[in-house]
Interface confidence: low
């Protein structure tokens, strides 16, 4: 079974070269793997990385530069992703998603 993407879209504006932090509000009891995607206009949603809550480890997708993104859980219901050294091409809609089964 899969959980749907939930929550309101939040807008973040940052300058080139700066960092941004995005928060993912998780449903109660969400465990396992939390995936982060970037969806840019005219492109397929691209998974950037996923967070393994069992081992608290981050797994980057192939082709993603280490250090560009980081993700961590601040509480059981809240996950954050840091985007560093922003460039114009980082613009888009970032999603978090979980599913099981």
């Amino acid at each position: 079974k899969s959980s749907n993407l939930e929550g309101r879209t939040k807008s973040v504006i940052r300058q080139t070269g700066s960092s941004a932090e995005i928060t993912c509000d998780l449903a109660e009891g969400s465990t396992g793997y939390i995936h982060w995607y970037l969806h840019q206009e005219g492109k397929a949603p691209q998974r950037l990385l996923y967070y393994d809550s069992y081992t608290s480890s981050v797994v980057l997708e192939s082709g993603i530069s280490p250090g560009k993104y980081d993700t961590y859980g601040s509480t059981r219901k809240n996950l954050r992703m840091i985007l560093r050294n922003l460039i114009e091409n980082d613009s888009g809609v970032y999603y978090c998603a979980t599913w099981d089964g």
Epitope: N4, R47, S62, G63, A97, W99
Partner: antibody, heavy 123, light 108 residues
């Protein structure tokens, strides 16, 4: 083992529409990208568009924008591709294909393919 | 969203190695490590041979290998066998998801 079973061959008139289905079994449906790829007789592969059911919205190749609609029914693990305003050049085998890994880009790793559906457009 | 460029045909004798190239741009092949290769026999659905530039799905022979340099990706088939005769297509993620023009491999 993941299996994709497509609907049967269709013969259509120019100007009409066709809707092809693709039923998935043997794996999680929602988190995998489903693409539609067509191949005209003697020609190469052409990506039409795709959908990741958990996202709900589809992406389309520019060439087919406005003429193709891709949907997915999570309750039946079935994806659909509808092509409208058919012309003779749309005569082709239409394949659905699923990515090898979850949450993947559409064309990056199409590890499972349907058997193909031949759509013939003729007056 | 134009197709990636592949040679129309390549050939080789059994036991030899052949390489098929796939040229794109910095917006597709050069910009992502998301190049795949598909094999297609006549009348059959394509089969994934390589993904993420150089990874082989389980069940695919290690005679097939992939690489990338700049905007060009390559598929190398070593120890050529008769059953390798087929059409080969590359693909890449980019501003649109695109396939290559296709290459017919003939085993002499």
């Amino acid at each position: 083992e993941v299996q994709l079973v497509e609907s049967g061959a269709e013969v259509k008139k120019p100007g009409s529409s066709v809707k092809v289905s693709c039923k998935a079994s043997g794996g999680t449906f929602s988190s995998y990208a489903i693409s539609w790829v067509r191949q005209a007789p003697g020609q190469g592969l052409e990506w039409m568009g795709g959908i990741i059911p958990i996202f709900g919205t589809a992406n389309y190749a520019q060439k087919f924008q406005g003429r193709v609609t891709i949907t997915a029914d999570k309750s039946t693990s079935t994806a659909y591709m509808e092509l409208s305003s058919l012309r003779s050049e749309d005569t082709a085998v239409y394949y659905c294909a699923r990515s090898l890994r979850d949450g993947y880009n559409y064309i990056g790793s199409l590890g499972y393919w349907g058997q193909g559906t031949l759509v013939t457009v003729s007056s | 969203q134009s197709a990636l460029t592949q040679p129309r045909s390549v050939s080789g004798s059994p036991g030899q190695s052949v390489t098929i190239s796939c040229t794109g741009t910095s917006s597709d092949v050069g910009g992502y490590n998301y190049v795949s290769w598909y094999q297609q026999h006549p009348g059959k659905a394509p089969k994934l041979m390589i993904y993420e530039v150089s990874n082989r799905p389980s069940g695919v022979s290690n005679r097939f290998s992939g690489s990338k340099s700049g905007n060009t990706a390559s598929l190398t088939i070593s120890g050529l066998q008769a059953e390798d005769e087929a059409d080969y297509y590359c693909s890449s993620y980019g501003s649109g998801s695109v396939f290559g023009t296709g290459t017919k491999l003939t085993v002499l």
